[in-house]
């Protein structure tokens, strides 16, 4: 059986939309599937790599690599999206291309970034971990770390940095899929909202879904002990 909840929820474009949340009900009137997984149920994607989930994550990453920051022209906010999902008339899509990106490092101004921009994250404004020396962030946003400390400046002069961010990574469903969503939408969908991250590639949703002890490598499920827990 399914339990359907419908509610008006604030979505990425800043408008309220009617959203359906479908929950698979437990036939025995007990915990939900997500709760059972958290409690240690035999759920194979938490024990070993699941090809289907792996391909979903790779597909999400490929899409994210090509994303940019969609900044609303009315200054109502910004969100990381694909160009096709960013209004050409109501918003500005900030994407580095044709030599408009910042240099990879101050030692070599000629080598420009082509991957980005990212809403609220920029190698020029992140102090920790700083993109410098032997630790230059790669020219692939899906390999960027989470910035834990921004430069102390209320205005950077960058469109994608000075806007109010409207969405962050949200881990939804037992498949460990990730979407950039508003907090409201994420909570309604019973997802896990990552306040600290800007990109889905910075979070490991399956690790969150499985719970218990974190994976040794967040990319590789290793909870073999589930076989004895349940």
């Amino acid at each position: 059986a399914q339990h359907v909840t419908t509610q008006l929820v604030l979505r990425n474009k800043g408008v309220y939309e009617s959203v359906k949340y479908i929950q698979q009900e437990n036939f025995w009137i007990g915990p939900s599937s997500i709760d059972l997984i958290h409690l240690g149920a035999k759920f194979s994607p938490c024990i070993r790599k699941d090809q289907q989930i792996e391909q979903l994550v790779l597909r999400e990453r490929d899409l994210e690599r090509d994303s940019g920051c969609c900044v609303q022209n009315d200054h109502s906010g910004c969100i990381q999206t694909q160009r096709k999902d960013c209004s050409e008339t109501l918003a500005t899509f900030v994407k580095w291309q044709d030599d408009t990106g910042p240099p990879m490092d101050k030692s070599d101004l000629g080598q420009k970034r082509t991957s980005g921009a990212v809403c609220h994250q920029d190698p020029r404004t992140c102090e920790e971990p700083a993109s410098s020396g032997a630790h230059i962030w790669p020219d692939d946003i899906t390999k960027w770390p989470i910035c834990t400390e921004q430069a102390k400046s209320n205005r950077t002069g960058f469109l994608h940095m000075d806007c109010q961010i409207k969405g962050r990574p949200c881990c939804i469903s037992t498949k460990g899929s990730c979407e950039i969503t508003t907090r409201e939408y994420c909570e309604f969908m019973h997802g896990y909202f990552h306040e600290e991250a800007t990109l889905c590639s910075q979070v490991h949703c399956l690790d969150k879904v499985c719970g218990l002890l974190p994976f040794l490598n967040p990319e590789v499920p290793d909870q073999f002990y589930r076989l004895w827990l349940s």
Epitope: D99, P103, K106, D108, L109, K112, R124, K152, T156, G157
Partner: antibody, heavy 120, light 107 residues
Framework: QVTLRESGPALVKPTQTLTLTCTFS??????????VGWIRQPPGKALEWLAH???????YYNPALKSRLTISKDTSKNQVVLTITNMDPVDTATYYC????????????WGQGTLVTVSS | EIVMTQSPDFQSVTPKEKVTITCRAS??????LHWYQQKPDASPKLLIK???QSISGVPSRFSGSGSGTDFTLTINSLEAEDAATYFC?????????FGQGTKLEIK
Amino acid sequence: QVTLRESGPALVKPTQTLTLTCTFSGFSLSTFALGVGWIRQPPGKALEWLAHIWWDDDKYYNPALKSRLTISKDTSKNQVVLTITNMDPVDTATYYCARITTYYYGMDYWGQGTLVTVSS
Amino acid sequence: EIVMTQSPDFQSVTPKEKVTITCRASQSIGNHLHWYQQKPDASPKLLIKYASQSISGVPSRFSGSGSGTDFTLTINSLEAEDAATYFCQQSYQWPLTFGQGTKLEIK
């Protein structure tokens, strides 16, 4: 409010070494993404970038003059010092210090400049 | 090094006129170009960054455009206080280089 002020001799003799000091306020050179550098302008001519020093002590010099230039900073005193060896009459110019940022590698604040004449 | 060439070297214009100053780079520099204004006996002042982005406190009559090798600084409805020399600067690669300047005289 950001201010920069250059100081140094108004007159130097050929072959001598010029030492210029930039004293600034309103920001710290330990602040991430900031640098201070020197640009000169011979009378009635274009601007020429000489050197920059960054918050992390990275230094960059104009290759055409690199062998003659040395830039250093004293963060506690809010000062940047530039020395130019083997001065020549063609080095006669107004020398400016300016703040630079890695945000766009442009100079957002400048000092008023100091005119240095090289003559025997 | 990248050579920046401005034109014209000198321009005499009347107030309220629209003025355009061009800057050409010896190689493509994307949008990594900035404009400065230098009034007589004063230090340069940043007007425009990244070819077209305005700087706070700079009058809106100043605007920039262009990418690649050709850039333009436009002053809409010139005012007497705009009498100055205008320089472009590239930050595409070291060493940072400037144009030779365009002197604007008000008739």
